[in-house]
Protein backbone atom coordinates (compact mmCIF):
# COMPACT_ATOMS: atom_id res chain seq x y z
CA UNK A 1 0.00 0.00 0.00
CA UNK A 2 2.77 2.43 0.91
CA UNK A 3 4.55 1.78 -2.42
CA UNK A 4 1.30 2.34 -4.34
CA UNK A 5 0.65 5.53 -2.42
CA UNK A 6 4.11 6.90 -3.15
CA UNK A 7 3.76 6.07 -6.86
CA UNK A 8 0.48 7.98 -6.95
CA UNK A 9 1.54 10.82 -4.67
CA UNK A 10 5.18 11.94 -4.83
CA UNK A 11 4.52 14.15 -1.79
CA UNK A 12 4.31 11.11 0.48
CA UNK A 13 8.08 10.70 0.07
CA UNK A 14 8.81 14.10 1.63
CA UNK A 15 10.09 13.55 5.19
CA UNK A 16 9.45 15.63 8.31
CA UNK A 17 11.35 18.90 8.09
CA UNK A 18 10.43 19.35 4.41
CA UNK A 19 7.33 20.19 2.40
CA UNK A 20 6.11 19.12 -1.01
CA UNK A 21 6.71 22.19 -3.15
CA UNK A 22 3.98 22.52 -5.80
CA UNK A 23 5.84 25.46 -7.32
CA UNK A 24 8.90 23.27 -7.98
CA UNK A 25 7.35 20.19 -9.57
CA UNK A 26 6.45 18.63 -6.21
CA UNK A 27 10.02 18.19 -5.06
CA UNK A 28 10.73 18.06 -1.32
CA UNK A 29 11.99 21.46 -0.17
CA UNK A 30 13.35 22.18 3.33
CA UNK A 31 11.06 24.15 5.61
CA UNK A 32 11.97 27.85 5.47
CA UNK A 33 13.38 29.55 8.57
CA UNK A 34 10.89 29.96 11.44
CA UNK A 35 8.75 27.04 10.25
CA UNK A 36 8.57 23.27 10.72
CA UNK A 37 6.82 20.09 9.60
CA UNK A 38 6.51 17.35 12.22
CA UNK A 39 5.22 14.68 9.82
CA UNK A 40 6.07 13.56 6.31
CA UNK A 41 4.05 14.32 3.20
CA UNK A 42 3.07 17.86 4.18
CA UNK A 43 2.33 20.41 1.45
CA UNK A 44 3.21 23.35 3.71
CA UNK A 45 5.34 23.94 6.79
CA UNK A 46 3.75 25.35 9.94
CA UNK A 47 4.86 28.63 11.50
CA UNK A 48 6.94 28.25 14.65
CA UNK A 49 5.45 29.35 17.96
CA UNK A 50 7.00 32.53 19.39
CA UNK A 51 7.74 32.55 23.12
CA UNK A 52 7.40 36.24 23.93
CA UNK A 53 6.53 38.45 26.86
CA UNK A 54 5.59 36.38 29.91
CA UNK A 55 6.98 33.33 28.09
CA UNK A 56 10.54 32.25 27.41
CA UNK A 57 11.78 29.55 25.06
CA UNK A 58 12.22 26.18 26.74
CA UNK A 59 12.93 24.36 23.47
CA UNK A 60 13.86 26.07 20.22
CA UNK A 61 11.82 25.45 17.10
CA UNK A 62 13.54 23.03 14.72
CA UNK A 63 12.67 22.01 11.16
CA UNK A 64 10.74 19.03 12.58
CA UNK A 65 9.21 20.32 15.85
CA UNK A 66 7.53 23.42 17.21
CA UNK A 67 9.08 25.62 19.88
CA UNK A 68 8.07 24.96 23.49
CA UNK A 69 7.62 27.74 26.03
CA UNK A 70 7.67 28.12 29.76
CA UNK A 71 7.23 31.17 31.97
CA UNK A 72 9.68 33.96 32.71
CA UNK A 73 10.81 34.51 36.32
CA UNK A 74 7.99 35.98 38.40
CA UNK A 75 5.40 33.85 36.59
CA UNK A 76 4.42 30.18 36.69
CA UNK A 77 2.75 27.82 34.22
CA UNK A 78 -0.93 26.98 34.32
CA UNK A 79 -2.11 23.74 32.77
CA UNK A 80 -0.20 20.79 31.42
CA UNK A 81 0.51 22.62 28.16
CA UNK A 82 1.74 25.78 29.91
CA UNK A 83 -0.50 27.76 27.59
CA UNK A 84 -0.79 30.47 30.24
CA UNK A 85 1.59 32.10 32.66
CA UNK A 86 0.20 33.43 35.93
CA UNK A 87 1.91 36.02 38.09
CA UNK A 88 3.69 34.76 41.21
CA UNK A 89 2.73 36.23 44.57
CA UNK A 90 4.71 36.16 47.82
CA UNK A 91 4.16 33.43 50.37
CA UNK A 92 1.29 34.59 52.58
CA UNK A 93 -0.60 35.97 49.56
CA UNK A 94 -2.97 34.82 46.83
CA UNK A 95 -3.64 36.17 43.35
CA UNK A 96 -7.02 37.86 42.88
CA UNK A 97 -8.47 39.79 39.94
CA UNK A 98 -7.02 42.91 41.53
CA UNK A 99 -3.53 41.47 42.03
CA UNK A 100 -1.72 39.84 44.96
CA UNK A 101 -3.55 40.15 48.28
CA UNK A 102 -2.50 39.03 51.76
CA UNK A 103 -4.17 35.92 53.16
CA UNK A 104 -7.06 36.70 55.50
CA UNK A 105 -6.59 35.90 59.20
CA UNK A 106 -7.01 32.17 59.73
CA UNK A 107 -5.68 31.23 56.30
CA UNK A 108 -2.21 30.67 54.87
CA UNK A 109 -0.30 30.05 51.64
CA UNK A 110 3.20 28.58 51.81
CA UNK A 111 3.78 28.87 48.05
CA UNK A 112 4.17 31.63 45.44
CA UNK A 113 1.08 30.36 43.60
CA UNK A 114 -2.36 29.05 44.46
CA UNK A 115 -4.91 30.13 47.02
CA UNK A 116 -4.90 30.82 50.76
CA UNK A 117 -6.14 27.77 52.68
CA UNK A 118 -7.62 27.61 56.19
CA UNK A 119 -5.37 26.69 59.08
CA UNK A 120 -5.80 23.14 60.31
CA UNK A 121 -8.42 22.92 63.08
CA UNK A 122 -6.46 20.95 65.69
CA UNK A 123 -9.48 20.50 67.96
CA UNK A 124 -11.25 18.39 65.33
CA UNK A 125 -8.65 15.70 66.02
CA UNK A 126 -8.78 16.29 69.76
CA UNK A 127 -5.39 18.03 69.62
CA UNK A 128 -4.15 21.41 70.73
CA UNK A 129 -2.24 24.12 68.87
CA UNK A 130 1.46 23.67 69.45
CA UNK A 131 2.63 26.45 67.11
CA UNK A 132 0.34 29.25 65.97
CA UNK A 133 -0.38 29.69 62.26
CA UNK A 134 0.73 32.68 60.22
CA UNK A 135 -0.12 33.96 56.72
CA UNK A 136 2.75 31.82 55.41
CA UNK A 137 2.47 28.71 57.60
CA UNK A 138 -0.20 26.35 58.88
CA UNK A 139 -0.61 25.79 62.60
CA UNK A 140 1.28 22.87 64.11
CA UNK A 141 -0.96 20.59 66.14
CA UNK A 142 0.32 18.89 69.24
CA UNK A 143 -1.22 16.30 71.52
CA UNK A 144 -3.82 17.33 74.06
CA UNK A 145 -2.35 17.45 77.60
CA UNK A 146 -3.94 14.08 78.42
CA UNK A 147 -1.99 12.49 75.55
CA UNK A 148 1.41 13.61 76.78
CA UNK A 149 3.42 10.55 77.80
CA UNK A 150 7.07 9.54 77.39
CA UNK A 151 7.92 8.60 73.81
CA UNK A 152 4.73 10.08 72.37
CA UNK A 153 5.15 12.13 69.22
CA UNK A 154 4.37 15.76 69.95
CA UNK A 155 3.86 17.08 66.41
CA UNK A 156 1.57 16.04 63.59
CA UNK A 157 2.42 17.19 60.08
CA UNK A 158 0.36 20.00 58.56
CA UNK A 159 -2.37 19.22 56.03
CA UNK A 160 -0.93 18.48 52.58
CA UNK A 161 -1.02 21.31 50.06
CA UNK A 162 -3.50 20.83 47.25
CA UNK A 163 -3.22 22.03 43.64
CA UNK A 164 -5.71 24.89 43.34
CA UNK A 165 -6.54 24.56 39.65
CA UNK A 166 -6.53 28.33 39.35
CA UNK A 167 -6.68 30.33 36.14
CA UNK A 168 -6.10 33.97 35.37
CA UNK A 169 -9.58 34.86 34.28
Amino acid sequence: FERTRSLQDPCSNCPAGTFCDNNRNQICSPCPPNSFSSAGGQRTCDICRQCKGVFRTRKECSSTSNAECDCTPGFHCLGAGCSMCEQDCKQGQELTKKGCKDCCFGTFNDQKRGICRPWTNCSLDGKSVLVNGTKERDVVCGPSPADLSPGASSVTPPAPAREPGHSPQ
Epitope: D46, L78, G79, G81, C82
Partner: antibody, heavy 117, light 106 residues
Amino acid sequence: EVKLVESGAELVRPGSSVKISCKASGYAFSLYWMNWVKQRPGQGLEWIGQIYPGDGYTNYNGKFKGKATLTADKSSSTAYMQLSSLTSEDSAVYFCARGQLGLDGYWGQGTTLTVSS
Amino acid sequence: QIVLTQSPAIMSASPGEKVTMTCSASSSVSYIYWYQQKPGSSPRLLIYDTSNLASGVPVRFSGSGSGTSYSLTISRMEAEDAATYYCQQWNIYPYTFGGGTKLEIK
Protein backbone atom coordinates in the same frame (compact mmCIF):
# COMPACT_ATOMS: atom_id res chain seq x y z
CA GLU B 1 -8.58 44.08 36.94
CA VAL B 2 -7.99 43.15 33.30
CA LYS B 3 -10.35 44.95 30.92
CA LEU B 4 -10.57 45.15 27.13
CA VAL B 5 -12.87 47.86 25.79
CA GLU B 6 -13.62 47.97 22.08
CA SER B 7 -14.77 50.91 19.97
CA GLY B 8 -18.45 51.34 19.08
CA ALA B 9 -20.54 49.91 16.26
CA GLU B 10 -19.72 50.97 12.70
CA LEU B 11 -21.92 51.34 9.62
CA VAL B 12 -19.79 51.74 6.50
CA ARG B 13 -20.08 51.66 2.71
CA PRO B 14 -18.83 48.78 0.55
CA GLY B 15 -15.28 49.35 -0.72
CA SER B 16 -14.30 51.56 2.21
CA SER B 17 -12.03 50.81 5.19
CA VAL B 18 -12.60 50.83 8.93
CA LYS B 19 -10.30 50.82 11.97
CA ILE B 20 -11.53 49.14 15.16
CA SER B 21 -9.79 49.75 18.48
CA CYS B 22 -9.36 47.72 21.65
CA LYS B 23 -8.16 49.57 24.75
CA ALA B 24 -6.51 47.38 27.38
CA SER B 25 -6.13 48.11 31.09
CA GLY B 26 -5.20 46.26 34.27
CA TYR B 27 -2.13 44.43 32.95
CA ALA B 28 1.22 44.95 31.20
CA PHE B 29 -0.03 45.49 27.63
CA SER B 30 3.37 44.89 26.04
CA LEU B 31 3.79 41.40 27.51
CA TYR B 32 0.71 39.68 26.04
CA TRP B 33 -0.48 38.91 22.52
CA MET B 34 -3.67 40.56 21.32
CA ASN B 35 -5.87 38.40 19.11
CA TRP B 36 -8.78 39.33 16.87
CA VAL B 37 -11.75 37.04 16.23
CA LYS B 38 -14.62 37.39 13.73
CA GLN B 39 -18.18 36.18 14.26
CA ARG B 40 -20.74 36.49 11.49
CA PRO B 41 -24.41 36.73 12.58
CA GLY B 42 -25.59 33.33 13.78
CA GLN B 43 -22.22 31.77 12.88
CA GLY B 44 -19.15 30.44 14.67
CA LEU B 45 -15.82 32.03 15.61
CA GLU B 46 -12.92 32.66 13.21
CA TRP B 47 -9.41 33.65 14.32
CA ILE B 48 -8.12 36.57 12.24
CA GLY B 49 -4.65 36.98 13.69
CA GLN B 50 -2.61 38.32 16.58
CA ILE B 51 -0.09 41.01 17.39
CA TYR B 52 2.58 41.12 20.07
CA PRO B 53 2.60 44.80 21.17
CA GLY B 54 6.11 44.53 22.63
CA ASP B 55 7.68 44.46 19.19
CA GLY B 56 4.79 44.61 16.71
CA TYR B 57 5.29 41.00 15.56
CA THR B 58 2.16 39.61 13.87
CA ASN B 59 0.68 36.25 12.86
CA TYR B 60 -2.27 36.17 10.47
CA ASN B 61 -4.75 33.57 9.39
CA GLY B 62 -3.98 33.29 5.66
CA LYS B 63 -7.66 33.88 4.90
CA PHE B 64 -7.41 37.42 6.31
CA LYS B 65 -4.04 38.47 4.86
CA GLY B 66 -4.64 41.59 2.80
CA LYS B 67 -8.00 42.12 4.48
CA ALA B 68 -6.93 42.83 8.08
CA THR B 69 -3.96 44.86 9.32
CA LEU B 70 -3.10 44.67 13.01
CA THR B 71 -1.23 47.40 14.87
CA ALA B 72 -0.69 48.37 18.50
CA ASP B 73 0.18 51.56 20.34
CA LYS B 74 2.07 50.82 23.55
CA SER B 75 1.76 54.39 24.85
CA SER B 76 -2.04 54.17 24.99
CA SER B 77 -2.26 50.37 25.54
CA THR B 78 -4.51 50.13 22.50
CA ALA B 79 -4.62 47.51 19.75
CA TYR B 80 -6.12 48.28 16.35
CA MET B 81 -7.46 46.26 13.46
CA GLN B 82 -7.96 47.91 10.09
CA LEU B 83 -10.23 46.12 7.60
CA SER B 84 -10.01 47.23 3.96
CA SER B 85 -12.03 46.84 0.72
CA LEU B 86 -15.11 46.04 2.74
CA THR B 87 -17.95 43.90 1.41
CA SER B 88 -21.12 42.50 2.95
CA GLU B 89 -19.09 39.39 3.88
CA ASP B 90 -17.20 41.54 6.37
CA SER B 91 -20.37 42.40 8.28
CA ALA B 92 -19.81 40.72 11.63
CA VAL B 93 -19.01 41.19 15.29
CA TYR B 94 -15.25 41.52 15.86
CA PHE B 95 -13.74 40.64 19.23
CA CYS B 96 -10.31 41.40 20.62
CA ALA B 97 -9.02 38.79 23.04
CA ARG B 98 -5.86 38.78 25.12
CA GLY B 99 -3.56 35.89 24.33
CA GLN B 100 -0.73 33.95 25.82
CA LEU B 101 -0.09 30.79 23.82
CA GLY B 102 -3.84 30.42 23.39
CA LEU B 103 -6.50 33.00 24.21
CA ASP B 104 -6.50 33.38 27.97
CA GLY B 105 -10.07 34.27 28.85
CA TYR B 106 -10.11 38.06 28.60
CA TRP B 107 -12.25 39.27 25.70
CA GLY B 108 -13.56 42.65 24.60
CA GLN B 109 -17.30 43.19 24.40
CA GLY B 110 -17.25 43.05 20.59
CA THR B 111 -17.63 45.67 17.85
CA THR B 112 -20.48 45.26 15.37
CA LEU B 113 -19.52 46.16 11.81
CA THR B 114 -22.26 46.57 9.22
CA VAL B 115 -21.27 47.02 5.58
CA SER B 116 -24.18 48.38 3.56
CA SER B 117 -24.84 50.82 0.76
CA GLN C 1 -4.92 24.13 8.91
CA ILE C 2 -6.43 21.96 11.61
CA VAL C 3 -10.19 21.51 11.23
CA LEU C 4 -12.19 20.98 14.42
CA THR C 5 -15.55 19.24 14.03
CA GLN C 6 -18.01 19.46 16.91
CA SER C 7 -20.90 17.10 17.43
CA PRO C 8 -23.75 17.19 17.82
CA ALA C 9 -24.46 20.58 16.24
CA ILE C 10 -27.58 21.00 18.39
CA MET C 11 -28.69 19.09 21.47
CA SER C 12 -31.13 19.50 24.33
CA ALA C 13 -31.03 18.25 27.90
CA SER C 14 -33.29 18.30 30.94
CA PRO C 15 -32.16 19.88 34.22
CA GLY C 16 -30.03 17.42 36.19
CA GLU C 17 -29.14 15.38 33.09
CA LYS C 18 -25.52 14.56 32.17
CA VAL C 19 -24.40 16.21 28.92
CA THR C 20 -21.40 15.25 26.76
CA MET C 21 -20.31 16.92 23.53
CA THR C 22 -17.30 16.10 21.38
CA CYS C 23 -14.65 17.88 19.34
CA SER C 24 -12.73 15.96 16.68
CA ALA C 25 -9.52 17.34 15.14
CA SER C 26 -8.41 16.65 11.56
CA SER C 27 -4.91 15.96 12.87
CA SER C 28 -3.46 15.45 16.31
CA VAL C 29 -3.33 18.43 18.69
CA SER C 30 -1.83 18.56 22.16
CA TYR C 31 -4.48 20.56 23.98
CA ILE C 32 -7.95 22.03 23.52
CA TYR C 33 -9.76 25.02 25.00
CA TRP C 34 -13.54 25.11 25.53
CA TYR C 35 -15.66 28.30 25.50
CA GLN C 36 -19.26 29.02 26.35
CA GLN C 37 -21.11 31.77 24.50
CA LYS C 38 -24.58 33.15 25.13
CA PRO C 39 -26.40 35.39 22.62
CA GLY C 40 -25.12 38.97 22.66
CA SER C 41 -22.12 38.13 24.85
CA SER C 42 -18.42 37.47 24.37
CA PRO C 43 -17.18 33.89 24.64
CA ARG C 44 -16.30 32.78 28.16
CA LEU C 45 -13.32 30.49 28.77
CA LEU C 46 -14.45 27.30 30.53
CA ILE C 47 -11.56 24.83 30.14
CA TYR C 48 -7.92 25.37 29.20
CA ASP C 49 -5.32 22.78 28.25
CA THR C 50 -8.00 20.11 27.77
CA SER C 51 -8.99 19.51 31.39
CA ASN C 52 -8.22 22.57 33.56
CA LEU C 53 -11.19 24.52 34.86
CA ALA C 54 -10.92 28.30 34.39
CA SER C 55 -11.47 30.50 37.42
CA GLY C 56 -15.10 30.83 38.50
CA VAL C 57 -16.34 27.95 36.34
CA PRO C 58 -18.63 25.51 38.21
CA VAL C 59 -17.14 22.08 38.93
CA ARG C 60 -19.96 20.39 37.03
CA PHE C 61 -17.96 21.21 33.88
CA SER C 62 -15.08 18.93 32.93
CA GLY C 63 -12.95 18.29 29.85
CA SER C 64 -10.97 15.31 28.64
CA GLY C 65 -9.36 13.78 25.58
CA SER C 66 -6.13 13.57 23.63
CA GLY C 67 -4.81 13.39 20.08
CA THR C 68 -7.76 13.98 17.76
CA SER C 69 -10.66 13.30 20.13
CA TYR C 70 -11.82 15.63 22.92
CA SER C 71 -14.97 16.07 24.96
CA LEU C 72 -16.72 18.49 27.30
CA THR C 73 -19.04 17.10 29.97
CA ILE C 74 -21.59 18.81 32.19
CA SER C 75 -22.31 16.42 35.06
CA ARG C 76 -25.75 17.89 35.84
CA MET C 77 -27.39 20.26 33.38
CA GLU C 78 -28.67 23.56 34.76
CA ALA C 79 -30.85 26.13 33.00
CA GLU C 80 -27.99 28.65 32.92
CA ASP C 81 -25.87 26.18 30.89
CA ALA C 82 -28.06 26.70 27.81
CA ALA C 83 -25.57 28.26 25.38
CA THR C 84 -23.31 27.50 22.41
CA TYR C 85 -20.03 25.73 23.21
CA TYR C 86 -16.89 26.03 21.07
CA CYS C 87 -13.65 24.08 21.15
CA GLN C 88 -10.42 25.77 20.00
CA GLN C 89 -6.85 24.65 19.31
CA TRP C 90 -3.73 26.80 19.74
CA ASN C 91 -1.26 24.08 18.77
CA ILE C 92 -0.69 25.13 15.16
CA TYR C 93 -1.26 28.43 13.33
CA PRO C 94 -3.84 29.45 12.38
CA TYR C 95 -5.72 28.98 15.62
CA THR C 96 -9.04 27.31 14.74
CA PHE C 97 -12.42 26.92 16.41
CA GLY C 98 -14.97 24.18 16.05
CA GLY C 99 -18.34 25.01 14.50
CA GLY C 100 -20.02 24.94 17.91
CA THR C 101 -22.58 22.83 19.76
CA LYS C 102 -25.79 24.59 20.69
CA LEU C 103 -27.12 23.24 23.99
CA GLU C 104 -30.77 23.89 24.74
CA ILE C 105 -32.77 23.23 27.87
CA LYS C 106 -35.71 20.80 27.62
